[in-house]
Interface confidence: medium
């Protein structure tokens, strides 16, 4: 999907609302410190690209973060502001309700939604020149 | 697939109230998200509000204080109550949940205007 058409700011009242506050309880507990941010994003496309890339698609050691709050918020103010998005997800959504898995927090998790805040961080000061 | 029937609309001065209902022929809740969009005359649609089933809500810009969102699980039932009503929230309102790119239901008219 091409995130390139949505509403960036209406994307980051949502985030700024109700979205940052579901990863800090998600994180609650965690040093800020303990993880070292690998993912990084150059543009507000890229960071939307790379945040449905982590918060959906599951990876090796935590296969479960589609069904946290702030997936499912994350996915709302996708298809919400972002034109077409919802009929992309249609069918990913059917087969993702018939492999529902039991939520676990692994350090893996962790670290995955750690880089999250990241990107989200930097989706919403797009000015900043990358480091 | 979740039936929804929007009503409550009608013609009401500046500075009144309304109350809008979305009756749900399923579980509201049985996901996570449903949201209240209104479409002024040739502009697009847009979300003015949004409730998710952790209890937390999200306003447009425009309607912040002035609108409130609720739900009732027991009825299968969403709310938008609507005060200080102002002419430019005059638009056609609908409810949708989770997604909706599978179509729309037909909506309720408000008309703010003296």
């Known amino acids: 999907y091409d995130f390139t058409n949505c509403d960036f700011e209406k994307i980051k009242a949502a985030y700024l609302s109700t979205i940052s506050k579901d990863l800090i309880t998600y994180m609650s507990g965690t040093k800020s410190t303990e993880f070292n941010n690998t993912v990084s994003c150059s543009n507000r496309p890229h960071c939307l690209t790379e945040i449905q890339s982590l918060t959906f698609n599951p990876t090796a050691g935590c296969a479960s973060l589609a069904k946290e709050m702030f997936a499912m918020k994350t996915k709302a103010a996708l298809a919400i502001w972002c034109p077409g998005y919802s009929e992309t997800q249609i069918n990913a959504t059917q087969a993702m309700k018939k492999r529902r898995k039991r939520k676990v927090t692994t350090n893996k998790c962790l670290e995955q939604v750690s880089q999250l805040q990241g990107l989200w961080r930097r989706f919403n000061r797009p000015l900043l020149k990358q480091q | 697939e979740v039936q929804l029937v929007e009503s409550g609309g009608g013609l009401v001065q500046p500075g009144g109230s309304l109350r809008l209902s979305c009756a749900a022929s399923?579980?509201?809740?049985?996901?996570?998200?449903m949201g209240w969009f209104r479409q002024a005359p040739g502009k697009e649609r847009e979300l003015v509000s949004a409730?998710?089933?952790?209890?937390?809500?999200y306003y447009a810009d425009s309607v912040k204080g002035r609108f409130t969102i609720s739900a009732d699980n027991s009825k299968n039932t969403a709310y938008l109550q609507m005060n200080s009503l102002k002419p430019e929230d005059t638009a056609v309102y609908y409810c949708?949940?989770?997604?909706f790119g599978t179509g729309w239901g037909q909506g309720t008219l408000v008309t703010v205007s003296s």
């Open positions: 949708a949940k989770d997604y």
């Open positions: 399923g579980s509201i809740f049985s996901s996570y998200w």
């Open positions: 409730i998710f089933s952790d209890g937390s809500t």
